[in-house]
Amino acid sequence: KVILDKYYFLCGQPLHFIPRKQLCDGELDCPLGEDEEHCVKSFPEGPAVAVRLSKDRSTLQVLDSATGNWFSACFDNFTEALAETACRQMGYSSKPTFRAVEIGPDQDLDVVEITENSQELRMRNSSGPCLSGSLVSLHCLACGKSLKTPRVVGVEEASVDSWPWQVSIQYDKQHVCGGSILDPHWVLTAAHCFRKHTDVFNWKVRAGSDKLGSFPSLAVAKIIIIEFNPMYPKDNDIALMKLQFPLTFSGTVRPICLPFFDEELTPATPLWIIGWGFTKQNGGKMSDILLQASVQVIDSTRCNADDAYQGEVTEKMMCAGIPEGGVDTCQGDSGGPLMYQSDQWHVVGIVSWGYGCGGPSTPGVYTKVSAYLNWIYNVWKAEL
């Protein structure tokens, strides 16, 4: 049975086996095509999601589709039902929390009262000015809180208490990539992790431990990537894994927050990386224990210099490392989070690519998560 499962796939109607390597090869080998059903699927970028959250106290903004202008949501007459609609528009299914926050003197966008129309937030046509002088601060999910704060040093062993969103993504029980829990159903990782094996069936997620082998595996229902863009082959290195059953959150299993749409991190901003990847370039062995390191944002201009990546780092990527080199993500860390701490922890990047590991002029290159928020929300909405 184990040998059969490992090497063969059972087609139905009529029942017969096909070699597992014929799964997800683009050919219909089973009469009903089920060998091509549970495969990595691509999902387009999709339309603009008409709500978003700002780094200014997680305040809600709404798009006026007629003009293309964004407005801040006034707290006047804002209700729990409107909060739920806003979060559903971003694909969240959990119960949101919201509160009033005072409009600041540097408030940039105009402010409007919000209403709902066919499950979407709209600007209330008949509304007056914002009487409360307050905005809506909205949290769709409790995220980004860990039991333990890491110490700022070079590279050290990590505890799952510090990083309860970190998961190991495994194929045939072998660690391939890292990933981050975003909500009970979804894990964020890198698309390139699935280049070799595009069948969903053999992929598993392990959560809740800092040791590689010691935690139960979770079945995966779907793996979703963005359509490939041949113009920018290294772009779009992002994937979402939908779990078969929702996670139960605990002290060691918790979600990390997505970044705000306007989360612009300046050079030298401190960030953190974690993973079970190689501890030496071409070192040939994964770390059994989760490792953590503090790094910083490296200016894209510096990263694209002639002695570095020569223009390969696009707007949808970011660089992080330390100026003198020596601290970096490596093979096996791919898909894991690049993290920023404000009030909560946010996954601002996904370990993507780089030349070597830890070189001074070639730091790690990360998928910029804020560039893909729209895609994430559209995937989640489609799967609600």
């Epitope: 003197p105 509304s127 002088g133």
Partner: antibody
């Protein structure tokens, strides 16, 4: 684009009243507060009061309380400022101005061209 | 009411000069301060809000700083069209009040 067009210059006798109009266009009239500010010849700016065009509620500076009335007509997107018991020191340019954003305390991002009111016997 | 005191009341400068105008509030107004420019016979024009945020369409040679009670408007390199009167205004508490103005003249 946002436009505030005010009525023409007025000459009034002391003790009379004047009513200045301000017609708004280029945005949803009821969604934004309207302020009135005046400027005596060669002097600085002086805030007079504010009106919420949605409900018509008003708030006036202490100095003008009892003499000023601000009203609006939503059908024509026009606000009015009436000042009574005029005296010579009320000679000034009167401006209507809209806030940058729909919040009472925010600065004035859009201004009318001004209406000169001269009080002279 | 909060009193706003501007200094100097007037200044003479040449094209290309760096010009600084200060505004002091009689009590703390956090960052609730705006700066306006007014040319003769025209309505005021908003330059800066929130003490340091540049209003859309305003040239970047204008900048604002400060919080609490002391604020500054700086014109980094004075241009011919910048000769005008400048007013500060507090929006922290009712009623809004303006400074007395600073007239920037050609030297």
């Amino acid at each position: 684009q946002v436009q505030l067009v005010q009525s023409g210059a007025e000459v009034k006798k002391p003790g009379a009243s004047v009513k200045v109009s301000c017609k708004a266009s280029g945005y949803r009239f009821t969604s934004q507060y309207m302020h009135w500010v005046r400027q005596a010849p060669g002097q600085g700016l002086e805030w007079m009061g504010i009106i919420n065009p949605s409900g018509g509620s008003t708030s006036y500076a202490q100095k003008f309380q009892g003499r000023v009335t601000m009203t609006r007509d939503t059908s024509t997107s026009t606000v009015y400022m009436e000042l009574s018991s005029l005296r010579s020191e009320d000679t000034a340019v009167y401006y209507c101005a809209r806030g940058r954003i729909a919040v009472a305390g925010h600065p004035l991002g859009y201004w009318g061209q001004g209406t000169l009111v001269t009080v002279s016997s | 009411d909060i009193q706003m005191t501007q200094s100097p009341s007037s200044l003479s400068a040449s094209v290309g000069d760096r010009v600084t105008i200060t505004c002091r509030a009689s009590q703390s107004i956090s960052s609730w301060l705006a700066w306006y420019q007014q040319k003769p016979g025209k309505a005021p024009k908003l330059l800066i809000y929130g003490a340091s945020s540049l209003q859309s369409g305003v040239p970047s040679r204008f900048s604002g700083s400060g919080s609490g009670t002391d604020f500054t408007l700086t014109i980094s390199s004075l241009q011919p069209e910048d000769f005008a009167t400048y007013y500060c205004q507090q929006a922290n508490s009712f009623p809004p009040t303006f400074g007395g103005g600073t007239k920037v003249e050609i030297k």
